[in-house]
Every structure is written in structure tokens, then in C-alpha cells.
């Protein structure tokens, strides 16, 4: 905390300008009026204030706005944003997407900090849902943003926002998250034709149920192995050899290289060896011919 001292004669700041970079910390405290600073925040970012000078400027704003800064100030914080704690940010009411963009720009190139996470949380909660423009903005700055949300938080994403999602935005999503996102994507892309639909839905298929995979197998989609390997094991297991062959098309040959990995390994164990042999890939581990397969889960359901 900077002690209160009188401003030296002739040093009272009439505007926020470059001359202030030569002021000592106590001079900034004594000679810069907090209300002047608040009205000229847009200038602060253009002036190369030192780390400690910025501490003083933040302190002045904190004194002026103990209940939290108004959005007119927040929008122009610039590098002062890096000085804010999550506690500071929780006092804010940020409603403008432009304000959000301005602050994310300051943090660009860095990991998502606790400050940024708090800011986004405040913003999204204020809006009530994660709309398309917000999602567009957040994934542009943080491609992994979507996958940092819990399934509960993802449930507030409207299907219309799914159009903003790029494949790389889903790279770190786990199956639970894709379970929530897939139905939204299916709804969002429902009016597209076959091949276009597959291109859009492909990155979300980690959340697809068996019946949707069966339907896709009838559409000559030629799913690549990387996508197939991300499918839910429980959704892949009921697929027949013929369905998997149709689903993968020319990529079916890749099954051999993946036969020891899930979901391929588990799927092989559920297929008749006869059927696997029809692929001509030398896949081993299927149910030997003549064995009866009992679906115990079905039996339990009936009893």
C-alpha cells in the first residue's frame, strides 16, 4: 500500500499521458486523480507503465470502486486486467461481448488463468446460456474451452451454438462431454444432406449411440480409423461385421493395426470368427464357429 503524501507543486496530472511514466509510485498515488484515471482508462494501455506503477493505478481504481468496476472501466483495463484477482473479477458485471474480447486479447497466447476462467464464468452466467457469438469468441481464444466445461455446464449450450465448434475444439473432450454435445450437434445439423452432415457431425461421434452408427453405415460415409477409435465402446459392440465394413469403407483395412486396442479389441471378441474372416484382414479372437452366444444382459432384462 502506498502511503498518502501531498502531490509536489506542478506535478498534478491533468490528463493520463506519457509523462506519468517518470513519476515515482508515491507521486502517482498523490498526483493522479482516480476519477480522471477512470475516464481516461483507454490511454493507460498505450503508455508503457512499469509493473509497480500499474499496481498503484489498480489501487486507485479499487478505492474509487470498492463494489467493483463499472463496465466502462473494465472494457479499457488492458494490461491492468493481469493485475486483477478472481475476487476482484467476481465483483464485476460484464455483459458486453466487446469487453470480453478486449480482456481475452490481453491474455492472448497465455494459458487460461484463474482470472480469465472467472471472467468467462461471470460473463456466461450473466447471459444465462452459452450463445453462438460467445462460444465463437471463447473457442477462438481457447480452442480447448468447450472441453473444460462440465457436462452440466455443456447442457446450457443451445444447439445453434454448435455451428461455431471446430474439430480441434473437441480434441480434449471426454466421452461424458461428447454424450451431451452429440445430441445437440445432431439437432443442429439435421437439415444437411448425407455427406455434408457427416463432415459436420464427425467430431461429435464420440457421443453417438449404436442406432446412429448403424444409420451412418447405410450412407457410404467412409469413416476414418481415428474417428472410429474415438467411438463409445458400448455403441460399437452391437455393430455387425457388415455394418462396420460399410461404416469404414476403404478404411476397414486399418482395423488390423488396431486389433489390440479398444474399441476394436472388444468388438472383435463379440463377433463370430466366420464373419471376421470375410474381411480378409486376419483378425483373430472372434467367437469360434459352433459356439452359442447368450446375451446375458437381455436375459436379465426379461427376468
Amino acid at each position: 500500500e502506498v502511503e498518502k503524501t501531498a502531490c509536489p507543486s506542478g506535478k498534478k496530472a491533468r490528463e493520463i499521458d506519457e509523462s506519468l511514466i517518470f513519476y515515482k509510485k508515491w507521486e502517482l498515488e498523490a498526483c493522479v486523480d482516480a476519477a480522471l484515471l477512470a475516464t481516461q482508462m483507454d490511454r493507460v494501455n498505450a503508455i508503457p507503465f512499469t509493473y509497480e506503477q500499474l499496481d498503484v493505478l489498480k489501487h486507485k481504481l479499487d478505492e474509487l470502486y470498492p463494489q467493483g468496476y463499472p463496465e466502462s472501466v473494465i472494457q479499457h483495463l488492458g494490461y491492468l486486467f493481469l493485475k486483477m484477482s478472481p475476487e476482484d473479477i467476481r465483483k464485476w458485471n460484464v455483459t458486453s461481448l466487446e469487453t470480453l474480447k478486449a480482456l481475452l486479447e490481453v491474455n492472448k497466447g497465455h494459458e487460461m488463468s484463474p482470472q480469465v476462467a472467472t471472467l468467462i464464468d461471470r460473463f456466461v452466467k450473466g447471459r444465462g446460456q452459452l450463445d453462438k457469438d460467445t462460444l465463437d469468441t471463447l473457442t477462438a481464444f481457447y480452442p480447448g474451452y468447450l472441453c473444460s466445461l462440465s457436462p452440466e455446464e455443456l447442457s446450457s449450450v443451445p444447439p445453434s451454438s454448435i455451428w461455431a465448434v471446430r474439430p480441434q475444439d473437441l480434441d480434449t473432450c471426454d466421452p461424458r462431454q461428447l454424450d451431451v454435445l452429440y445430441p445437440k450437434a445432431r439437432l443442429a445439423f439435421q437439415n444437411m444432406n448425407g455427406s455434408e452432415y457427416f463432415v459436420k457431425i464427425q467430431s461429435f461421434l464420440g457421443g453417438a449411440p449404436t442406432e446412429d452408427l448403424k444409420a451412418l453405415s447405410q450412407q457410404n460415409v467412409s469413416m476414418d480409423l481415428a474417428t472410429f477409435m474415438k467411438l463409445r465402446t458400448d455403441a460399437v459392440l452391437p455393430l455387425t461385421v457388415a455394418e462396420v465394413q460399410k461404416l469404414l469403407g476403404p478404411h476397414v483395412e486399418g482395423l488390423k493395426a488396431e486389433e489390440r486396442h479398444r474399441p476394436v479389441r472388444d468388438w472383435i471378441l463379440r463377433q463370430r470368427q466366420d464373419d471376421l474372416d470375410t474381411l480378409g484382414l486376419g483378425l483373430q479372437g472372434g467367437i469360434p464357429n459352433g459356439y452359442l452366444v447368450l446375451d446375458l444382459s437381455m436375459q436379465e432384462a426379461l427376468s
Epitope: 517518470f22 515515482k24 490511454r43 498505450a46 508503457p48 509493473y51 509497480e52 494490461y79 493481469l82 493485475k83
Partner: antibody, heavy 122, light 107 residues
Framework: QVQLVQSGAEVRAPGASVKISCKAS????????IHWVRQAPGQGLEWMGI????????AYAQKFQGRVTMTRDTSTSTVYMELSSLRSDDTAMYYC???????????????WGQGTLVTVSS | DIQMTQSPPTLSASVGDRVTITCRAS??????LAWYQQKPGKAPKLLIY???SLASGVPSRFSGSGSGAEFTLTISSLQPDDFATYYC?????????FGGGTKVEIK
């Protein structure tokens, strides 16, 4: 790669002015500040001032106030430093150098121009 | 202005030696201190920033330490390429100021 390329050596008579250029490439010009530092023959380094290429704001060390002017041309990513009323003790190597535009914790000079030798002699 | 004082002004050493250069500030500069290496006829080159962070591409034999008003640059095992002049610089407040330099020469 990051480069700051300065204009060639200059010889001036006492009382004259000199204008040196520093052309930036390999980085986003607007995201950095450009500083000017000089070094008299066999001497240490002396900070002259700073310019923000983005807004054009600038600040000069008190010693050079009234004699130095820093300007920029964003269309060519070039910064200029003009020093007037030259004296013999202004004979020095003049360097431009950059620092990132940041929260104040990065005002170290991470890339430097090759230097421009200014000789003041009658 | 903050005065930066380096010692020693000149240092004679041999290849393989451990070399330490000191920089003192006339007032507290926190950790806002950088070190540069300069060879004759060349521009200075950043070695260390924020007192102890190694700049990109700088060999790990260089290290920096200190905070407040006293800082050191250490070269753990002097190499032929390290004979040069070294400068410290504070960026705690304006004007930015440099130490007078320490010339490391061959013994």
C-alpha cells in the same frame, strides 16, 4: 525471424540534426514498444526514450527532452529517432531495441538493431 | 534516477572458470533486472530477464539471481565465446538504467 534493421552511419557538423531509422520485421510491430539506447565510444549504455508504435505515444529521458523526437510509420513498420542541436559528445552508436507491450514486467530489451554510428565533427 | 553499479569493472579469467559478476541498485528494483552480453562492434544480446529467467537460446551455463538491490550473474564454466562485456539493466522505473559494464577478459 525477428529483425530490427537500422539505417547507415552518419556524419554531422555540430548544431545539425540527424534522423535514424529502424525497420522492424518478423513480429507484430504494434504489439511491442521500441526503445532507443546509445553508447558513446568505449562507454556504457544510455537509455534515450521509448515509443509505442501502436498509438504513437512516446516518452524521452529528461537529458534528451527538447532535442529528441521519436516517430513511427506503421505502414512500413519503421521507427525514427531524430536528435537535434548535435554536439561532439553525441558521437555514439545509436541502437533501437524492442520490448513487448505488457503489464510492465517485460521491459527488458530482447532484440536489438545492429546500431547506427553517428559522428559529430566539424 | 536509479543508479546501477557493477563490480568488478574488469575480470580476468580462464576457460573453465566459474565467474560471478555483481550488480547493485541504488534502490529496491524488486526482480526487474536484466543482463546483457556485448561483444566488440556488436549490439548487446539479452541473457537473463526478471533477475533469473534465461532468455531463449542462451546456454544454461549462464544464470542470474538476486532481488531487491543486489544481483549476480554467474557463468558456471567460462567458454571461449563468453569473453565479452556484460551489463545489467533495471526496469523497475523510468528512466531505464544500465550498469557501467564488466569486461571479462582472458587471463
Amino acid at each position: 525471424q525477428v529483425q530490427l534493421v537500422q539505417s547507415g552511419a552518419e556524419v554531422r557538423a555540430p548544431g545539425a540534426s540527424v534522423k535514424i531509422s529502424c525497420k522492424a520485421s518478423g513480429f507484430t510491430f504494434r504489439g511491442y514498444y521500441i526503445h532507443w539506447v546509445r553508447q558513446a565510444p568505449g562507454q556504457g549504455l544510455e537509455w534515450m526514450g521509448i515509443i509505442n508504435p501502436s498509438g504513437g505515444s512516446r516518452a524521452y529521458a529528461q537529458k534528451f527532452q527538447g532535442r529528441v523526437t521519436m516517430t513511427r510509420d506503421t505502414s512500413t513498420s519503421t521507427v525514427y529517432m531524430e536528435l537535434s542541436s548535435l554536439r561532439s559528445d553525441d558521437t555514439a552508436m545509436y541502437y533501437c531495441a524492442r520490448t513487448a507491450s505488457c503489464g510492465g514486467d517485460c521491459y527488458y530489451l530482447d532484440y536489438w538493431g545492429q546500431g547506427t554510428l553517428v559522428t559529430v565533427s566539424s | 534516477d536509479i543508479q546501477m553499479t557493477q563490480s568488478p569493472p574488469t575480470l580476468s579469467a580462464s576457460v573453465g572458470d566459474r565467474v560471478t559478476i555483481t550488480c547493485r541498485a541504488s534502490e529496491n528494483v524488486n526482480i526487474w533486472l536484466a543482463w546483457y552480453q556485448q561483444k566488440p562492434g556488436k549490439a548487446p544480446k539479452l541473457l537473463i530477464y526478471k533477475s533469473s529467467s534465461l532468455a531463449s537460446g542462451v546456454p544454461s551455463r549462464f544464470s542470474g539471481s538476486g532481488s531487491g538491490a543486489e544481483f549476480t550473474l554467474t557463468i558456471s564454466s567460462l567458454q571461449p565465446d563468453d569473453f565479452a562485456t556484460y551489463y545489467c539493466q533495471q526496469y523497475q522505473s523510468y528512466p531505464l538504467t544500465f550498469g557501467g559494464g564488466t569486461k571479462v577478459e582472458i587471463k
